[in-house]
């Protein structure tokens, strides 16, 4: 029978599919930075090249005895999870091992850097097919390790890293916190976060998705035919590295941005019980478990979007938070969220030639998050249309006046703190389709984009009664690009996108006697790409 | 995903310029020193000296050599363990923490990061 972890990540209808080239080989190469490995194990024999790379610290303790099977345990198991004959994900994939962890599973940032540089040098000396680098290790936050990952990713290498086993925010660890790395948390057979003794999987906004990481059967270094189960975010990352290898084998032209977006789009959503995570991390942690996406031939051409959260701004009055998309992605909208509700809104601005999403804290606020909606859309061209704050008078609509440009998102901010002003409606599709509507004292920013066949519409859902949140989802075939809260009588905490659902959060005043005009509304901008059609705004 | 983690960044007090070797680096240090926030994971004595992105390969080697020369003047032994160039310009150096202030004044230095442990997950 198929082990639970493989059944979970490769849907039954895909399990018969041939994921290597006609001769059974794979053009994708996976580099594993880990302990030494037992290359003679039946699971991985003939698939693994042990490079001469070795950069490890001395083992601690005078009484430490190097036992080959113990030294090889972690790396051998992971090599088996990636490409093992029976228990592996990408069964035909060739793997290169670099030793950066000693017999106690310890390494150094510097050793890892030298390992990453070794891979880059190998790539320059002998260019090959797509490369995947698996980093089943974690240390404290390291700017230089993150930078090295970023630079390697820019050369076309896909890096997959363990989120870490510290039951903590993955952003505090490296390489997990590197934005260019695909960071993987661990779930068990019940799709719940993995507990490891008193600790467990890391979580938070630096995690891209989760994958099986508990009691994973794989190659054991005890003997060449032995198997054992191991647990951790390393195992989870190995599953995703295997999935990525399969995706690249089918379609070697896939970029890192496309791979990440497709992993997110086709993951299993909302199966993880978020109560396991600290309360303040639940909104930031993705509720998705990896599965092998279908090939691009079956699903190509669609608009792919993901949500990127900023770091918390901190509580100072002028604090800001900035969320950035990957270089290939387009920022289609920007929103903000504050647990206290004290925020001065959000806006898109250019920093160093890149559009970023910025959220502004307000006096007395505990801090804000910026929430960017980052999308992949061929030949897209976006611009921001701003209306400065009106000192008095009616609301000022901002629309996309350029030909064939459609509204993909609305942002707004106040130069001065005005909580009452925030309770005024912002975006209305009725009567004024395709425009952002501001009000006095708010600056309004419309995100207007042009791409072949891009069409968008606003979808709203309002709740008149007491509620902490209102949601609205884009229907099948449409992708959420923008999300706003249109407040009723309550103070809005902000809005953010969770996959294809727009979530408007409010601090409920508890009044049950509201009129429908006072209803809190979640307003989603839903778009789709139909390459044959012209860009258009769809009137609901 | 993250810009700066829970991370220690320190501006170090700099030694005075007292001999001709140091006069070459008479600019004020804007470089910072960084180290792991978890003390038990730190590896003091080994540092990655990270240079500005546009630094040329020859300048990397010259900077490492200059640091060695300056340090030797003061009686400090430095071991340049590795020179980085393919992913970022910089070098890995084994040296006394006493020399950090001096190293931060070197031309082209963006920041210096103390080495730290990573662990199998």
């Amino acid at each position: 029978s198929i082990p639970w972890n493989l059944e979970r990540i490769i849907p039954a209808w895909q399990q018969t599919e041939e994921d290597s080239s006609p001769d059974g080989s794979s053009q994708v190469e996976v580099y594993l930075l880990d302990t030494s490995i037992q290359s003679g194990h039946r699971e991985i024999e003939g698939r693994v090249t042990i490079t001469d790379f070795n950069s490890v610290p001395e083992e601690d303790g005078t009484r430490f005895h190097r036992q080959a099977s113990k030294c090889d345990s972690h790396g051998t198991h992971l090599a088996g999870v990636v490409s093992g004959r029976d228990a592996g994900v990408a069964k035909g994939t060739s793997l290169h091992s670099l030793r950066v962890l000693n017999c106690q599973g310890k390494g150094t940032v510097s050793g890892t850097l030298i390992g990453l540089e070794f891979i880059r040098k190998s790539q320059l000396i002998q260019p090959s097919g797509p490369l995947v680098v698996l980093l089943p290790l974690a240390g404290g936050y390291s700017r230089i390790l993150n930078t090295a990952c970023q630079r390697l990713a820019r050369t076309g290498v896909v890096l997959v890293a363990a989120a870490g086993n510290f039951r903590d925010d993955a952003c505090l660890y490296s390489p997990a916190s590197a934005p260019e790395v695909i960071t993987v948390g661990a779930t068990n057979a019940q799709d719940q976060p993995v507990t490891l003794g008193t600790l467990g999987t890391n979580f938070g906004r630096c995690v891209d998705l989760f994958a099986p990481g508990k009691d994973i059967i794989g190659a054991s270094s005890d003997c060449s035919t032995c198997y054992m189960s191991q647990s951790g975010t390393s195992q989870a990352a190995a599953h995703v590295a295997g999935i990525v290898a399969m995706m690249l084998n089918r379609d070697p032209a896939l970029t890192l941005a496309e791979l990440r977006q497709r992993l997110i789009l086709f993951s299993t959503k909302d199966v993880i019980n978020m109560a396991w995570f600290p309360e303040d991390q639940r909104v930031l942690t993705p509720n998705r478990v990896a599965t092998l996406p279908p090939s691009t031939q079956e699903t190509g051409g669609q608009l792919l979007c993901r949500t990127v959260w900023s770091a918390h701004s901190g509580p100072t009055r002028t604090a800001t938070a900035t969320a950035r998309c990957a270089p290939e992605e387009e920022l289609l909208s920007c929103s903000s969220f504050s647990r206290s509700g004290r925020r001065r809104g959000d806006r898109i601005e250019a920093i160093g030639g890149q559009q970023v999403c910025k959220a502004l804290n307000a006096f007395g606020g505990e801090g804000v998050y910026a929430v960017a909606r980052c999308c992949l859309l061929p030949r897209v061209n976006c611009s921001i249309h701003n209306t400065p704050a009106a000192r008095a008078g009616p609301q000022t609509p901002v629309h996309c006046h350029q030909k064939d440009h459609v509204l993909t998102g609305c942002s707004f901010h106040w130069e001065v703190e005005n909580l009452r002003a925030q309770q005024q409606p912002l975006l209305r599709s009725r009567h004024q389709p395709g425009q952002c509507v501001g009000h006095q004292e708010a600056s309004v920013h419309a995100s207007c984009c042009h791409a072949p066949g891009l069409e968008c519409k606003i979808k709203e859902h309002g709740i008149a009664g007491p509620a902490e949140q209102v949601t609205v989802a884009c229907e099948a075939g449409w992708t959420l690009t923008g999300c706003n809260v249109l407040p009723g009588a309550s103070l809005p905490l902000g809005a953010y996108s969770v996959d294809n659902v727009c979530v408007a959060r409010i601090r409920d005043a508890g009044r049950a006697d509201r009129t429908s005009e006072e209803a809190t509304v979640a307003a989603a901008i839903c778009c789709r790409s139909r390459p044959s059609a012209k860009a258009s705004w769809v009137h609901q | 995903q993250d810009e700066d983690g829970d991370y220690e960044e320190l501006m170090l007090a700099l030694p005075s310029q007292e001999d001709s070797l140091v006069d070459e680096a008479s600019h004020v240090a804007t470089a910072t020193f960084r180290r792991c926030s978890k003390e038990a994971w730190r590896l003091p004595g080994t540092y990655v000296v990270v240079l500005m992105e546009e630094t040329q390969r020859l300048q990397v080697e010259q900077t490492a050599h200059r640091l060695q020369t300056w340090a030797a003047r003061r009686g400090y032994v430095i071991k340049v363990l590795h020179v980085f160039y393919d992913l970022f310009p910089g070098f890995l150096v084994k040296m006394s923490s006493d020399l950090l202030g001096l190293a931060l004044k070197l031309p082209h230095v963006e920041y210096i990061e103390e080495d730290s442990l990573v662990f199998a997950q």
């Epitope: - | 030694p15 005075s16 007292e18 030797a72 003061r74 009686g75 032994v77 006394s96 006493d98």
Partner: antibody, heavy 114, light 108 residues
Framework: QVQLVESGGGLVQPGGSLRLSCAAS????????MHWVRQAPGKGLEWVSN????????YYADSVKGRFTISRDNSKNTLYLQMNSLRAEDTAVYYC???????WGQGTLVTVSS | DIVLTQSPATLSLSPGERATLSCRAS???????LAWYQQKPGQAPRLLIY???SRATGVPARFSGSGSGTDFTLTISSLEPEDFAVYYC?????????FGQGTKVEIK
Amino acid sequence: QVQLVESGGGLVQPGGSLRLSCAASGFTFSDYYMHWVRQAPGKGLEWVSNISGSGSTTYYADSVKGRFTISRDNSKNTLYLQMNSLRAEDTAVYYCARGMFDFWGQGTLVTVSS
Amino acid sequence: DIVLTQSPATLSLSPGERATLSCRASQSVNSNYLAWYQQKPGQAPRLLIYGASSRATGVPARFSGSGSGTDFTLTISSLEPEDFAVYYCQQWGDVPITFGQGTKVEIK
């Protein structure tokens, strides 16, 4: 100009103690490693000990380990060598030297004899 | 420990002659930390050469150093009367710091 002046030498009985000082001037003392080197009468140079600029790192020759202690007071620009359990073979001229041994003091004679 | 062996123990030469002093290490020495000193009776040693080949401030050009790995040489191209003294090589790249036993350059 750089100057190093040793003091504290003298005659001491075996098993006794002595504390040598080296007063430094003309340079930023705390930037430099400092060393003690000795020379027995008619013999060659023997390195004894050194200390880093901050005082955080010290090294000793095996022949003096556990008996001698090097220290420094950067506020006073002074280097010290505390010598305990002295032996006849410790008889020598003791020099302090700066950094890369580019400047030396004139030396102070320590005689261990009963 | 790195043992430095100097040869010859004594070198008897006349002023104007060329002196070649050798220093051999028991294991490879980082040449950045190889130095030569001159010592005259009743005086402290004086640094002549650092980094195996760089002349210290104020040292005449007739003194030169060369070598790498385990073999190093101090050359005095033309001996002056004030050059007759004891010369020591030293390595300070590894602890313990070690000196050679010295070469005495005397007037023939």
